[in-house]
Structure formats: structure tokens, C-alpha cells
Interface confidence: low
């Protein structure tokens, strides 16, 4: 038994051109979290049980808001390690999938929404008890830097966590033929009960007299590599007992399998074992069905009863994309007429109209200057469909009833910056706050509200939460 530990060092734009857009914005702050999935490297059941060795989910990272005009930096990460406990022997060869998820933090009505930012995968050989191994993986324009290790939980020790340690029976030395249990020098190895000659590096036993092999090794004493065929080529020297000593570049290097598929070498090329929902030579074809729940953010899945027929996600208002994974910026359609300010609240659009206009989309022109009173010596002006008061010096607002500097009263909460505007004032909120006056903390320990479910769904209908 033991624990696989993963430390994420950074997640940000990779080198080279085509830097990705920041996943967060001033209007939609967000935070990251990570998911790791482990499976034994040569396991044939990997496709059906994608996380046979275990999986773990990180905490959420700090809230991040993009600074307009600044390049996308490395994004703030969650604290701590991702830990995946394993009960049995550490397999030595394993496959991993690391997913980077974004939690968008909506406003008081919109609520959080999850979407997958990047997924990286690979296959590695790792001995338990060794030092941290560093790795860099790229997914599109993103780059993920991380370290990992496998460590045994006492009393297990060894590269596969299969040798056991016991406290010394005598204070000075271990029993005959038994070594001290590094690094626990005050303990001794338990008596060996495996078959005589069973490889201490590549074999282990759980019952007396047996010799079970770690992934990649075979033979009665686990001394023969599973495949030495690659060593008969010019790629590297071979040995009947030790296998490849210095493997050269192989067809699985760089993992040609997409979407988290694991690569296995074949005598001529390679073979991808695809996770559920994908198929094809490189796992590049999606075989997802509605039963897999592919529609995010409350999308309704239609069709796709079998992997060969396509499914369609019918997205709720405010979301788009083939899997409803993208939040629509409905304000980009400029639905507010006559210069109205558009607010996308997630569940609905709202227009904040300029003086002289009203209606859901500011489409109604209010009464003209007839009967309109402008206070404090202001005069009513008609022009371009807008009817407003031209105020005397020192006054402002729709009816000239406000003092000229609407920011003097410091109306923006939580450190928001106030800007005078022809229709009043505008608050530019500090990161983590929103609302017309920055009065709503984005995530004040559970104060943000959640979006309503789309209409017409029954229990059992495909739907996503957050």
C-alpha cells in the first residue's frame, strides 16, 4: 500500500506563438482546479476502468481576474498535493490523465459553471520510494508543469511497496539473512516468503512460495521483460535477462494517443487503448453517447443512442458549443438600443437605459421636452432621438438634480473605482467583486446564488450542475 502524490507547479501559456486567451476575465472571474486519473500502464482493462489505480480532485485555486491588456500569466494554483492512495503493489509502469478545470464565478444570479480547460496524458515508469520526478506536458497552447512520486505507507517498503518492515527483535542487529529496512534503520525486513530466486526488483508475493511479476516483467522469477522485441532492433542493446538497457526513440514516445488514450508498442507500430467515449487509431474520434452525459451546463442531449450516431446538445440560454461548454456573451449582439448598457446576468439579459429611454431593450423613447422639467436652471434639449436636460454648471443627472461630481460620495463599494458618465456614474470593481456598485462579493464563503435549472426537465433528464 502507498500513496501517489502529484504537485502542480504551474499552468499557463506554453512557449511560442499563439498564446491562449486568459480563461478568466474582469466580467467573469474564475479559479482553477485539477483532477488526476491513474491506471496501471499495461492493463488491458484500462479502457473500461479509466482510473483503476485511483483518482483525486484538488481544492479550488484562488480567484483570478484578468488584468485588461496584460499577457496571460501562469494562473494561480490550488494549495497542496493531489494524493491518490493505492492498496496493492505499485505497478511500476502507469498511465496518467491530468485535467485542468475552470470554475467560472458568475454574479449574484449566474452562479459558478465548470468547464474543462486542458487535458494531458502520458505513460511513465516510476519506482516507489524514489525522488520527485519532474514533467512538462502541453495541451494545445497551454503548458502544465508538475512533479510526482509514489511512496509506500509503513510497514511496506521497496520499489513496489511489497516488502514489509518489522521492529527489531534485538536492539543491535537484524536476524540471520535479514537486512536493515532503509530508510527505517531501526527496523528489519520481514522474512522473505517468496519463491526462491524471485526478482526483488520486478517480483513480489502475497502468499508464501509465489512470485508475481510487476507490469512489464514475466517468467517464473520475473526476470524476463514482457517484450524484448524492440531491443532486437537498432534502438538499443538487448539482454535476455535484463531487457532493454538504453531504449532509443519508440513509436509511443510523446504519446500519439489523443484524449487520454494509453499507448502500447506493437512489433510494427503502436496501438492506442482509448478511454470510454473515444475510438480511432489515435483515439481522435468521439464515440460519446447521450448515456455518457456529454452536455454541460444543463444542456439537453438528443439522439446518439449508439457510438456511431451523433448526439446533439440543446443548450440552455446563455451557453453554446457542441457540448454547451461555452458561456455566450449575449451582450456582443448589442441587444440594447439607443445606447443602453447591456448586462448579461446569466439567466437573463438586462439593459440599463440612457436617460430618455425605457423598455426591456431601451426601445421606448420617453416623452419629449413637452412638460419636462429640468431642475436647477437646466434646459431640455432634443436631439438624435434623445431628450435630456442640459444642466447648468455644477449640476448633473437626468433632471439636473444631482451635484456635478457623482463620484464625490464614493458610491463604489469594496475599493471599486468610480468614473463619471453622461448618464450618472460607472463603477469599475476590484477583483473578486461585481454588481452595479461592486456590492456583491463574487465568492464570499457561499453567498453567490445559483442558476435556475432549464425549464421542462424531468428527473433523469441529462443535466449538469455548476
Amino acid at each position: 500500500a502507498g500513496v501517489f502524490e502529484l504537485q502542480i507547479h504551474s499552468f499557463g501559456p506554453g512557449p511560442g506563438p499563439g498564446a491562449p486567451r486568459s480563461p478568466c476575465s474582469a466580467r467573469l472571474p474564475c479559479r482553477l482546479f485539477f483532477r488526476v486519473c491513474l491506471k496501471p500502464g499495461l492493463s488491458e482493462e484500462a479502457a473500461e476502468s479509466p482510473c483503476a489505480l485511483g483518482a483525486a480532485l484538488s481544492a479550488r485555486g484562488p480567484v483570478y481576474t484578468e488584468q485588461p491588456g496584460a499577457p496571460a500569466p501562469d494562473l494561480p494554483l490550488p494549495d497542496g498535493l493531489l494524493q491518490v492512495p493505492f492498496r496493492d503493489a505499485w505497478p511500476g509502469t502507469f498511465s496518467f490523465i491530468i485535467e485542468t478545470w475552470r470554475e467560472e464565478l458568475g454574479d449574484q444570479i449566474g452562479g459558478p459553471a465548470w468547464s474543462l480547460l486542458a487535458r494531458v496524458a502520458g505513460r511513465r515508469r516510476l519506482a516507489a520510494g524514489g525522488p520527485w520526478a519532474r514533467d512538462i506536458q502541453r495541451a494545445g497552447a497551454w503548458e502544465l508543469r508538475f512533479s510526482y512520486r509514489a511512496r509506500c505507507e509503513p510497514p511496506a517498503v521497496g520499489t513496489a511497496c511489497t516488502r514489509l518492515c518489522r521492529p527489531r527483535s534485538a536492539p543491535s542487529r537484524c536476524g540471520p539473512g535479514l537486512r536493515p529496512c532503509a530508510p527505517l534503520e531501526d527496523e528489519c525486513e520481514a522474512p522473505l516468503v517468496c519463491r526462491a530466486g524471485c526478482s526483488p526488483e520486478h517480483g513480489f508475493c502475497e502468499q508464501p512460495g509465489e512470485c508475481r511479476c510487476l507490469e512489464g516483467w514475466t517468467g517464473p522469477l520475473c526476470t524476463v521483460p514482457v517484450s524484448t522485441s524492440s531491443c532486437l532492433s537498432p534502438r538499443g542493446p538487448s539482454s535476455a535477462t535484463t531487457g532493454c538497457l538504453v531504449p532509443g526513440p519508440g513509436p509511443c514516445d510523446g504519446n500519439p494517443c489523443a484524449n487520454g488514450g494509453s499507448c502500447s508498442e506493437t512489433p510494427r507500430s503502436f496501438e492506442c487503448t482509448c478511454p470510454r467515449g473515444f475510438y480511432g487509431l489515435r483515439c481522435e474520434v468521439s464515440g460519446v453517447t447521450c448515456a455518457d452525459g456529454p452536455c454541460f451546463n444543463g444542456g439537453l442531449c438528443v439522439g446518439g443512442a449508439d457510438p456511431d450516431s451523433a448526439y446533439i446538445c440543446h443548450c440552455p440560454p446563455g451557453f453554446q458549443g457542441s457540448n454547451c461548454e461555452k458561456r455566450v456573451d449575449r451582450c456582443s449582439l448589442q441587444p440594447c438600443r439607443n445606447g443602453g448598457l447591456c448586462l448579461d446576468l446569466g439567466h437573463a439579459l438586462r439593459c440599463r437605459c440612457r436617460a430618455g429611454f425605457a423598455g426591456p431593450r431601451c426601445e421606448h423613447d420617453l416623452d419629449d421636452c413637452a412638460g419636462r422639467a429640468c431642475a436647477n436652471g437646466g434646459t431640455c434639449v432634443e436631439g438624435g432621438g434623445a431628450h435630456r436636460c442640459s444642466c447648468a454648471l455644477g449640476f448633473g443627472g437626468r433632471d439636473c438634480r444631482e451635484r456635478a461630481d457623482p463620484c464625490a460620495a464614493r458610491p463604489c463599494a469594496h475599493g471599486g473605482r468610480c468614473y463619471a458618465h453622461f448618464s450618472g456614474l460607472v463603477c469599475a470593481c476590484a477583483p473578486g467583486y461585481m454588481g452595479a456598485r461592486c456590492e456583491f462579493p463574487v465568492h464570499p464563503d457561499g453567498a453567490s446564488a445559483l442558476p435556475a435549472a432549464p425549464p421542462g426537465l424531468r428527473p433523469g433528464d441529462p443535466q449538469r450542475y455548476l
Epitope: L57, R60, D292, G293, D445, R464, Y465
Partner: nanobody, 117 residues
Framework: EVQLVESGGGLVQPGGSLTLSCAAS????????IAWYRQAPGKKRELVAG???????DYLHSVKGRFTISRDNAKNSVYLQMNSLRAEDTAVYYC???????????WGQGTLVTVTS
Amino acid sequence: EVQLVESGGGLVQPGGSLTLSCAASASSVTLLSIAWYRQAPGKKRELVAGISTDGSTDYLHSVKGRFTISRDNAKNSVYLQMNSLRAEDTAVYYCYAYTWTTRLPYWGQGTLVTVTS
């Protein structure tokens, strides 16, 4: 597959309190994001409160301060404590779970809460 069983609904007077329970089987509640939805007759279903895998909670604006969502890992259950109930809280309340291992949603069958004098 995750099974969700709700209980605790019933008839209560305005200003009264109720606690709804959602028991999850086949998966630990620590690995699930669980929420309570409600649907009043003739209205859309709306999300009332949610608790994520990290324990963070979110509430519908109109119930904030009156309702509290909590999780008991030992009993593998999630609760919705509802205080200061109003007539507009009358609805069928559904437990909903999102599981990370399969990324699939699951619903309970619902429990009726009626607030009337």
C-alpha cells in the same frame, strides 16, 4: 450508479422549520457535488442550494440566511435546514448529485414541502 433518497418533507405553518435529508448510496458524498432543487406547481425548477466536493456552499438569493445546506460524511447524507418558511417555499424538493468519477448527474424522486396556515 448513485441512488438518492429524500426524506423530511411535510406540512408546516409559515415561519416554521423543516430539515430535508438526502441519503446517497454507492458513492461517498465527499466525492459528489450535491444540490437541492425545487419545483412549485406551474413553475420552473430552480436550484436552491449546493455543496461542492470542497465543502463550499452556494444559495439562491431568496433563501440565503434562512436555509442551510450541510453534509454528514459518516452518514453519507446531505441536509437542507429550512427556517422561517414562507408560502412561496411550497414545492417538491429534489436532491441532485453530480459524480466526478463518471461525470453524470443523478436525481432523487422528490419530497413535497407545503407551507400553509
